[in-house]
């Protein structure tokens, strides 16, 4: 809110723009017939600092020189970078209600003179494109500093473009807005950065570069791929270049991979073959172009090119196996179960599954195709039966995989021995086991199954198995293992036409079960007496129960219970106990035992033997 | 526990047919694979047909393409319908369901339903 100096002027010494740490001196001067009306011995002139519009210091005690009532000159000192503002106003002291009134205002830049330019770099976007050079401005200057770029070149070739920096633009990179064609390639052009403001000036070392050092090619287009014969592993990149490119690299990668497949190609004139490619797969394909073999930079990578290679025919053997239930006098259930193919096995969307059932020796054969990865058929108890599965997609089959259908815990002999089960953490289990001791024929391999001690389904709830090499000893299973459930788990030991199998029972993580057993009834047969229960239901088992536990005391008796412990056997739901009084009343509960402890007591109920003492 | 109950059966004609129904209760969430058995006179209980719960079903040789296992999950019950039918179909027919804990299988049965096919 100045009045355009209409009552004075301010001067600065040695000038409005300073170098940090300098001292300026600064003078407001009354114009004639200007001041406080009939007293002039009383105008008071006073300065006043702003900094980004806010006052921050009355200049009053900073006053060198005092022509009363005409003019006084400031020295300031300790500026900082940047503009400051300083106002001179007049203050009529007769006249206390009056504020001061502005006279004339100034402002002082203080900054640094620019550093020479360094780093400078300049490029040309492809063949048509214009050379624009960048450099680093180093320290800040605080000032408007101006910026020349100047090329010059063979035949008298010059060229020249400015830019300025200040506190609202900084300039570090200038568009020359020439083309250096390719029939330069030889030819040396130099460039140098001029900076210049209020404090000094100063250049840049002088960059000298060729074409081929600075043109970047732009990166290729239209990228396409052709698949020879709808090969899925073989393929020719297609691509558009600039005229000049010699060299190009390639990268291509499957979509969920971490590392590129890289390639170079001489001359290769916007076509390439591939002849590593993975089927039925994802890829992303880019392409780099440069303008000559030793020198010169890479162009930027294409955009991606996403593709999915095309299926072939499933390779791998798929992995079987099954379980045999003897459903009526002379038929048995064989239900088939195999784990899907891996992707670079399947090479292509499955779309079927082709089983075969097959009696050796009579050569009755059962066919069928499923979408599933089950399949289930009742056939004869008699004879000897094989089973094979192969994979399709719509390229053809993989090769099926035999299995011979034996009884797999019928040989005692080929029954593996001290079968053991450890939980390693919260979500797998080790097994370890010996081979059968007097096994009449060689081990072909083991497998080992398991299956959630819970009710479920045959078809809905397939086995887990895993198969281990005949010189290996245990296993480490996760697959569906969860903590808290306990599992059954066989490990079978096969020979080419029996199999024998040992069981045994494994959590990977246990607390105490919710509950006991509820006991459901108590009688009394010859002297002793059967307590029956209903198991825990599955999810308050949590985990593999060790043994039940069956306590007893007399009704009303603050002695210890006494207590009967047994094996836990689902199968078993009853349990005889001998050694209470005829005619006393006794109180009666049960307890379940996991490996983490024992389970709060189930129902109690009262019982009063009427046989005679043991 | 599971309970299952037959019904359908009944007196019929050679060449007849008749529609047996299996209702599930109790603890069916993971009974899935439902089977019928059929007992004649002086014979062993044998193996009629089953469906599983992917709905794939599988019959004895002397009833195939005469004889079709369905099943309507939302009613819990499974149906046998039987046509052509001859005198050595006649047994009680028993609705049978299985599933596994580990590796034993519990089976649960019906009372059974008489079908009495004349010649």
């Known amino acids: 809110n100045i009045d355009v100096c209409k009552l004075g002027t301010v001067t600065v010494q040695p000038a409005p723009v300073i170098p940090l740490g300098s001292a300026a001196n600064i003078s407001c001067s009354l114009n004639p017939k200007q001041g406080c009306s009939h007293y002039p011995s009383s105008n008071e002139l006073i300065l006043l600092k702003f900094v980004n519009d806010v006052l921050v210091e009355n200049l009053h005690g900073k006053k060198v020189h005092d022509h009363t009532g005409h003019s006084s000159t400031f020295q300031v000192t300790n500026l900082s970078l940047g503009m400051t503002l300083f106002v001179c106003k007049l203050n009529c002291s007769n006249s206390q209600k009056k504020p001061p009134v502005p006279v004339c205002g100034v402002e002082i830049s203080v900054g640094v003179a620019p550093e020479p330019p360094q780093n400078i770099s300049c490029v040309q976007e492809g063949e048509n494109g214009t050379v624009a050079c960048s450099w680093n401005s180093g320290k800040v200057t605080y000032l408007k500093t101006n910026y020349t770029l100047q090329l010059s070149g063979p035949n008298n070739l010059t060229c020249q473009k400015q830019c300025f920096s200040d506190n609202r633009q900084n300039c570090n990179r200038l568009d020359l807005g020439i083309n250096l064609s390719p029939d330069l390639a030889e030819s040396r052009f130099i460039v140098r950065v001029t900076a210049i403001n209020d404090l000094g000036n100063s250049s840049s070392l002088p960059h000298t570069f060729t074409f081929l050092d600075i043109v970047i090619p732009l990166p290729p287009w239209d990228i396409r791929i052709n698949f020879l014969n709808a090969s899925g592993s073989r393929g020719t990149l297609q691509w558009e270049d600039e005229g000049q490119v010699v060299l190009n690299q390639l990268r291509y990668q499957p979509l969920n991979s971490t590392s590129w497949n890289m390639v170079n190609a001489t001359n290769a004139k916007g076509k390439y073959d591939l002849r590593d490619l993975r089927p039925f797969t994802e890829y992303e394909f880019q392409i780099s172009s440069k303008l000559h073999l030793s020198g010169g930079s890479w162009s930027n990578w294409s955009e991606s090119l996403r593709t999915r290679t095309p299926e072939e025919e499933p390779v791998g053997i798929l992995d079987i196996w099954y379980m045999k239930q003897d459903i009526d006098y002379d038929r048995q259930q064989i239900s088939l179960f195999w784990k899907s193919l891996n992707p670079s096995e399947a090479r292509g969307k499955i779309l079927h599954y082709q089983v075969t059932l097959q009696e050796v020796t009579k050569k009755t054969t059962l066919q069928n195709t499923t979408r599933h990865t089950s399949w289930t058929r009742v056939i004869p108890r008699t004879g000897a039966w094989t089973a094979s599965v192969s994979a399709a997609n719509s390229k053809g089959a993989s090769a099926p995989t035999h299995i011979n259908i034996v009884d797999l815990c019928g040989t005692g002999l080929l029954a593996p021995h001290q079968v053991s089960a450890k939980s390693e953490n919260m979500d797998n289990i080790l097994v370890t086991w010996q081979p059968p001791k007097k096994a009449d024929s060689a081990v072909r391999e083991y497998i080992v199954e398991w299956r959630a001690l819970q009710p479920g389904s045959i078809t809905k709830f397939p086995p887990h198995w895993l198969r281990i090499p005949p010189d290996n000893m245990s296993a480490l299973i996760s697959e569906n293992i969860k903590p808290y459930i306990c599992y059954e788990i066989r490990v079978h030991a096969l020979s080419e036409s029996q199999g024998g199998c040992s069981s045994i029972r494994g959590d990977s993580k246990h607390k105490a079960p919710v509950s006991g057993p509820h006991i459901t009834a108590i009688t009394e047969k010859k002297e002793r007496l059967f307590i029956s229960w209903t198991h825990i239901p599955f999810p308050e088992q949590r985990g593999c129960i060790l043994h039940y536990r069956i306590y007893w005391k007399e009704r009303d008796s603050t002695a210890q219970p006494e207590l009967c412990e047994i094996q836990y056997r689902r199968s078993q739901n009853s349990h005889p106990i001998s050694s209470l009084q005829p005619r006393v009343t006794y109180v009666l509960w049960m307890t379940a035992v996991t490996a983490a402890g024992e389970s709060p007591q189930g129902n109690e109920r009262e019982f009063c033997p009427q046989g005679k003492a043991n | 526990q599971v309970q299952l109950q037959e019904s359908g059966g009944g007196l019929v004609q050679a060449g007849g047919s008749l529609r047996l129904s299996c209702t599930a209760s109790g603890s069916i969430f993971a009974i899935d694979d439902m089977y019928w058995y059929r007992q004649a006179p002086g014979k062993q209980r044998e193996f009629v047909a089953y469906?599983?719960?992917?709905?794939?079903?599988n019959y004895l040789d002397p009833v195939n393409g005469r004889f079709t296992i369905s099943r309507d999950n939302a009613k819990n019950s499974v149906y046998l319908q039987m046509n052509s039918l001859k005198p050595e179909d006649t047994a009680v027919y028993y609705c049978?369901?299985?599933?596994?804990?580990?590796?034993?299988?519990?089976?649960?049965w019906g009372q059974g339903t008489q079908v009495t096919v004349s010649s």
């Open positions: 469906i599983t719960a992917t709905n794939s079903a």
């Open positions: 049978n369901a299985k599933q596994i804990v580990g590796f034993q299988i519990d089976e649960y």
